[in-house]
Amino acid sequence: AILGRSETQECLFFNANWEKDRTNQTGVEPCYGDKDKRRHCFATWKNISGSIEIVKQGCWLDDINCYDRTDCVEKKDSPEVYFCCCEGNMCNEKFSYFPEMEVTQPTSNPVTPKPPYYN
């Protein structure tokens, strides 16, 4: 392992899709991939009228957008389907939405919003 990097070997697995097909829908997924490629965990979910509906969680493969992210955080503003990825075993157990604010001149003291965490 490279010093300072969290090697991802397993991720929390969930597939809402499988419920209707009576297949095991939750567990721990071992992540496989080329030796020279990085592996990550991900979570994807929807916000239906304030209620969080997890769609999928599991392993994600070598994606520069996931490099060195220890927390699973969605930063896009109001996506239709939320997605985050991270590095480190089971790092997708918790995920959050923390939109990056557009940089504008503050009219008052800026407040850093705390990301809501889901698990």
């Epitope: 095991n24 071992p30 239709e80």
Partner: antibody
């Protein structure tokens, strides 16, 4: 690197069943996601279902529900697809395929295919 | 069932050209979209997964983009070995479905 080797071509009568095998070489067979995809002559691709051997329960496309059975034997690293009540429209090449991940990111390793011909 | 459509159904191009194939899903599939190449008598080969991730060993002239319902596969600087049929596939929701294919022929 996983390799998938399928059983040979079959000729079947309408109404009968066929069972195609797919032997995996390489490690971790039990925790791979194995899917079955078919392709009728000159036609497109059709996903039939899949299985993660350690879980044992298969996930089927509604179209084939009740007619297809997908199983896996961890001791021999072999997956099976059985299709019953065969009709002429089932004439196709049947592929077993490994998925990149359990959440089906992409079908990255394909068997060589098994031609199943249904004819009276 | 999510229906996948592809356009064009066939196209002719020359070596060195850049071509773009479009795939549309009848419902949103987020980024659960893969692209395959198939040559006659052979099994399909995965090129791109997760809409834009290039599979290891696939030449960088292949690229994918899109999310939701609209996706594209671009092949830049076409090589003789690229003339084949290309399929998209969604794996967001069962049954996983494929597009009807785009046949890329040499002009």
């Amino acid at each position: 690197q996983v390799q998938l080797v399928q059983s040979g071509a079959e000729v079947k009568k309408p109404g009968s069943s066929v069972k195609v095998s797919c032997k995996a070489s390489g490690r971790h067979f039990g925790s791979l996601q194995i899917s079955w995809v078919r392709q009728a002559p000159g036609q497109g691709l059709e996903w039939m279902g899949g299985i993660i051997p350690i879980y044992g329960t298969a996930n089927y496309a509604q179209k084939f529900q009740g007619r297809v059975t997908i199983t896996a034997d961890e001791s021999t690293s072999t997956a099976y697809m059985e299709l019953s009540s065969l009709r002429s429209e089932d004439t196709a090449v049947y592929y077993c395929v490994k998925d990149l991940t359990w959440t089906n990111l992409g079908l990255d390793i394909w068997g060589q295919g098994t031609m199943v011909t249904v004819s009276s | 069932e999510i229906v996948m459509t592809q356009s064009p159904s066939s196209l002719s191009a020359s070596v060195g050209d850049t071509v773009t194939i479009t795939c549309r899903a009848s419902q949103g599939v987020s980024r659960w979209l893969a692209w395959y190449q198939q040559k006659p008598g052979k099994a399909p080969r995965l090129l791109i997964y997760a809409a834009e991730q290039l599979l290891s060993g696939v030449p960088s002239r292949f690229s994918g983009s899109g999310s939701g319902t609209h996706f594209t596969l671009t092949i830049s600087s076409l090589q003789p070995e690229d003339f084949a049929t290309y399929f998209c596939q969604q794996s967001y929701s069962t049954p996983f479905t494929f597009g009807p294919g785009t046949k890329l022929e040499i002009k």
